[in-house]
Interface confidence: low
């Protein structure tokens, strides 16, 4: 029943153009190009996309026309390599163009930058945006795709089309409203926050495929889809996993046209077969394509079948466990994961994968023993501490969150993580700890049965951000170790890290703690980031500082900012009071 088995096409570019339509074709090519050449100006990309589109149209008209039989990688790579400033702008990435396909594409992929040196996107005034939208809607929306894609080179391309559709809808509605700003700004904030979350989730999928292989991704998908579709048969889940793996492998590999096309096919298949998949898909399947695919990806878990037998019968008590395992190891482990996951929507996916790994390790050992059954009889007892560890951690941290509130909870995590891995750059520590801290508002409100899947799977996404940023400029062996040893044990690995006793404290630099009147005009969020940056620097100077010492200094700092922002001569206040604050902080921390 393979969805993706298609007849061979004479011209791949014509095939994708016809399947996707001109609008989606152009949008996806623009995303692909912007994700590869992240520094190129918008106008250059638009020109390249238009040239590719014109070429595709000639191939639709005549599939046997010259070059129409070339692979998409060859066509797109050749086009990217025509950029005149490649060497000056991208340095060694230009060497990719000396290679042949498929390694030229591999080379481009390896030069994708998770943290490109691009200016922060500043939102113009609402009237300015509405004028630009009305003047040239098409260019306005292309600019959105371009700006998001170049800043998020692994953004899930078909999902970015869905975001662009919502972005357009927001402007269409709000630019006609009486109070444009009140209508538009909350929608843009929501899109921005959802977009960042979507980008980070997709980045984890790509890291899983690229760093740990297809088997790791498939295991994740079996667990997640079994939780979501507990009434589906194992064969059905396996088929969905195979197809989903193909879609994500394509998108992570830069094959965005194939990815979008195959995702549409997968949505179509799921909707045609909802009776054997899930009772929760009806509403999703009535929506247009982009909304449909998004809705399916976010659909709530179906109810568990009422009469599921005990797992022990097939996976512990049966005399055939080793025989079944030996015959087809991955299939047997897949069935174990499926059966366990569909019974446990209350577990995180990473916990389910840890349990499956423990089960696999036990069978590897026991099936070679004199009495295999005796050896693996107590395997389920080994699961208890694995289940309790995240439960206890979430309970403690939700209590702390409820006691402190989000900002102070983030600060507690900033201190905790800076002490664990003080070599990591301050902006990265601030960004990651702020995101780790958001787990409180996101997950602690949920009942017990939903807390762990929410919290631990979200933490996996955030810690992957740390891993990909650290990989670009590695500075800590401990981070490298936690990031590379095991995908499913990253969070426990980071949780287990103690204060780094080998760290030599940073030299004190008063400049780091010098503030100016511009802080007064910042938004509350940006002001928090300034204060949290100072907190990380304090911990790097004085890693042995106690919570109480750090709290006292941060309270003084908050009072200092508040006082000077109310002063008539703000700049003088920041200069004079700032010196006093630095001196007092040094004394308080014994610097």
């Amino acid at each position: 029943r393979g969805v993706f088995r298609r007849d061979a096409h004479k011209s791949e570019v014509a095939h994708r153009f016809k399947d996707l339509g001109e609008e989606n074709f152009k949008a996806l090519v623009l995303i692909a190009f912007a994700q590869y050449l992240q520094q190129c100006p918008f106008e250059d990309h638009v020109k390249l996309v238009n040239e590719v589109t014109e070429f595709a149209k000639t191939c639709v008209a005549d599939e046997s026309a010259e070059n129409c039989d070339k692979s998409l990688h060859t066509l797109f790579g050749d086009k990217l390599c025509t950029v005149a400033t490649l060497r000056e702008t991208y340095g060694e990435m230009a060497d990719c163009c000396a290679k042949q396909e498929p390694e030229r594409n591999e080379c481009f992929l390896q030069h994708k930058d998770d943290n490109p040196n691009l200016p922060r996107l500043v939102r113009p005034e609402v009237d300015v945006m509405c004028t630009a939208f009305h003047d040239n809607e098409e260019t306005f929306l292309k600019k959105y795709l371009y700006e998001i894609a170049r800043r998020h080179p692994y953004f899930y391309a078909p999902e970015l089309l869905f975001f662009a559709k919502r972005y357009k809808a927001a402007f269409t509605e709000c630019c006609q409203a009486a109070d444009k700003a009140a209508c538009l700004l909350p929608k843009l904030d929501e899109l921005r926050d959802e977009g960042k979350a979507s980008s980070a989730k997709q980045r984890l999928k790509c890291a899983s495929l690229q760093k740990f292989g297809e088997r790791a991704f498939k295991a994740w998908a079996v667990a997640r889809l079994s939780q979501r579709f507990p009434k589906a048969e194992f064969a059905e889940v396996s088929k969905l996993v195979t197809d989903l793996t193909k879609v994500h492998t394509e998108c992570c590999h830069g094959d965005l046209l194939e990815c979008a096309d195959d995702r549409a096919d997968l949505a179509k298949y799921i909707c045609e077969n909802q009776d054997s998949i899930s009772s929760k898909l009806k509403e999703c399947c009535e929506k247009p394509l982009l909304e449909k695919s998004h809705c399916i990806a976010e659909v709530e878990n179906d109810e568990m079948p009422a009469d599921l037998p005990s797992l022990a019968a097939d996976f512990v008590e049966s005399k055939d466990v080793c025989k079944n395992y030996a015959e087809a190891k991955d299939v047997f482990l897949g069935m174990f994961l499926y059966e366990y996951a569909r019974r446990h929507p209350d577990y995180s996916v990473v916990l389910l994968l840890r349990l499956a790994k423990t089960y696999e390790t036990t069978l590897e050992k026991c099936c070679a023993a004199a009495d295999p059954h005796e050896c693996y009889a107590k395997v389920f007892d080994e699961f208890k501490p694995l289940v309790e560890e995240p439960q206890n951690l979430i309970k403690q941290n939700c209590e702390l969150f409820e006691q402190l509130g989000e900002y102070k909870f983030q600060n507690a995590l900033l201190v905790r993580y800076t002490k664990k891995v003080p070599q990591v750059s301050t902006p990265t520590l601030v960004e990651v700890s702020r995101n780790l801290g958001k787990v409180g508002s996101k997950c602690c409100k949920h009942p017990e049965a939903k807390r762990m899947p929410c919290a631990e799977d979200y933490l996996s996404v955030v810690l992957n951000q740390l891993c990909v940023l650290h990989e670009k400029t590695p500075v800590s062996d401990r981070v490298t170790k936690c990031c590379t040893e095991s995908l499913v044990n990253r969070r426990p690995c980071f949780s287990a890290l103690e204060v780094d006793e080998t760290y030599v404290p940073k030299e004190f630099n008063a400049e780091t703690f010098t503030f100016h009147a511009d802080i007064c005009t910042l938004s509350e969020k940006e002001r928090q980031i300034k204060k949290q940056t100072a907190l990380v620097e304090l911990v790097k100077h004085k890693p042995k500082a106690t919570k109480e010492q750090l709290k006292a200094v941060m309270d003084d700092f908050a009072a200092f900012v508040e006082k000077c922002c109310k002063a008539d001569d703000k700049e003088t206040c920041f200069a004079e009071e700032g010196k006093k604050l630095v001196a007092a902080s040094q004394a308080a921390l014994g610097l």
Partner: nanobody, 115 residues
Framework: QVQLVESGGGLVQAGGSLRLSCTAS????????MAWYRQAPGQQREFVAR???????NYPDSVKGRFTISRDNAKNTVYLQMNSLKPEDTAVYYC?????????WGQGTQVTVSS
């Protein structure tokens, strides 16, 4: 991590044959594709052959019909059978592997084709 060790290089007359082997160890379950590359002195590293987990292969025109890549999954080994060797095939041959693209590399084995 994945470790790759090449063997089988050496000196051979033009028109002769050689068979290179590359054995993988470590986290080999993550490996979906393996390949051979080569680098002649002062030249760019160049792609020679690739094989996917499913067994599909591809080659550049310069070696097509002369070189064959194959793999023995049981031995975690990939082979490169090189026939009708030419002096311009002289290079250090590297084995490479990875889950989605080649990110792990061997140390290389020297192949010299004399005329």
């Amino acid at each position: 991590q994945v470790q790759l060790v090449e063997s089988g290089g050496g000196l051979v007359q033009a028109g002769g044959s050689l068979r290179l082997s590359c054995t993988a160890s470590g986290s080999i379950e993550s490996i979906n594709r393996m390949a051979w590359y080569r680098q002649a002195p002062g030249q760019q590293r160049e792609f020679v052959a690739r094989i996917s987990k499913g067994g599909s292969t591809n080659y550049p025109d310069s070696v097509k019909g002369r070189f064959t890549i194959s793999r023995d999954n049981a031995k975690n080994t990939v082979y490169l059978q090189m026939n009708s060797l030419k002096p311009e095939d002289t290079a250090v041959y590297y084995c490479a592997a990875g889950p989605v693209w080649e990110q792990f590399w061997g140390q290389g084995t020297q192949v010299t084709v004399s005329s």
